[in-house]
């Protein structure tokens, strides 16, 4: 089995990257449901 | 200890397409990002992206989109970088770089009529 | 982008001297999560880069103490205590902070 690396200075980026996506959807399901809820 | 192992030189026709490898071995490849730089005029650094083998999630260089297409073979180790229709600003030192940390031995390409 | 400044384009040196080389970015490159993602490689003549210094002033496996990295924010520094002719070649600092990843356009390290 080969080690994983002690040393990654990019894995950062990705992470930002999925929380930005992650708080994107966020907003828009909130939007989704604010059109739904004002639309009853 | 970590190796990354590049494909070798390459001369190539304007126009065309062409293909990079990168085998890595001596650590788990899916855990840690391979990032790919371009090196031209046997100085100037430029960061063309990344890939996380895991997930195949990608971050380009707006300046690259386009122009390289990453992608990995996780059951071999290696990740690859397509170049697209290549022109003489293309020719360069391409490197791959496991975690911005480990580089492979570099890729000359060069692209000549 | 972020632009990364080293200064000086060339350092003649005479081996056992102290050398120091600066590089400044155009933004702070304190990330979010607390790091500053600035790197130093050196790229010796028909090699690739190796990695020296991350995250400002950790030294990477292998790497002698006569090399230290030390700044914050948008002003670092590169210290190699005694030059050894091994040490000759050129250096790059590099940011990982901000996307795109930018590079220094190298200073190198020569005999006098």
């Known amino acids: 089995d080969n080690p994983s690396l002690s040393i990654d200075l990019t894995f950062h980026l990705l992470r930002t990257l999925l929380e930005l996506a992650r708080t994107q959807s966020q907003r828009e399901r909130a939007e989704q449901n604010r059109i739904i809820f004002d639309s009853v | 200890e970590v190796q990354l192992q590049q494909s070798g030189p390459e001369l190539v026709k304007p126009g065309v397409s062409m293909k990079i490898s990168c085998k890595a071995s001596?650590?788990?490849?899916?855990?840690?990002?391979m990032n790919w730089v371009k090196q031209s005029h046997g100085k100037n650094l430029e960061w063309i992206g990344l890939?996380?083998?895991?997930?195949?999630?990608?971050i380009y260089n707006q300046k690259f989109k386009g122009k390289a297409t990453l992608t990995v073979h996780k059951s071999s180790s290696t990740a690859y970088m397509e170049l697209l229709s290549l022109t003489s600003e293309d020719s360069a030192v391409y490197y791959c770089?496991?975690?911005?940390?480990?580089w492979g031995q570099g890729t000359l390409v060069t692209v000549s009529a | 982008d972020v632009v990364m400044t080293q200064t000086p384009l060339s350092l003649p040196v005479s081996l056992g001297d102290q050398a120091s080389i600066s590089c400044r970015s155009s933004?702070?490159?304190?990330?979010?999560?607390?790091?500053?993602?600035l790197h130093w490689y050196l790229q010796k003549p028909g090699q690739s880069p190796e990695l020296l210094i991350y995250?400002?002033?950790n030294r990477f496996s292998g790497v002698p103490d006569r090399f230290s990295g030390s700044g914050s924010g948008t002003d670092f520094t590169l210290k190699i205590s005694r030059v050894e002719a091994e040490d000759l070649g050129v250096y790059f600092c590099?940011?990982?902070?901000?996307?795109?990843?930018?590079f220094g356009a190298g200073t190198k390290l020569e005999l006098k």
């Open positions: 770089a496991n975690g911005f940390a480990y």
């Open positions: 001596g650590y788990s490849f899916t855990d840690s990002t």
């Open positions: 890939i996380h083998p895991d997930n195949g999630g990608t």
């Open positions: 933004q702070s490159l304190l990330h979010s999560n607390g790091n500053t993602y």
């Open positions: 995250k400002v002033s």
């Open positions: 590099s940011q990982s902070t901000h996307v795109p990843l930018t």
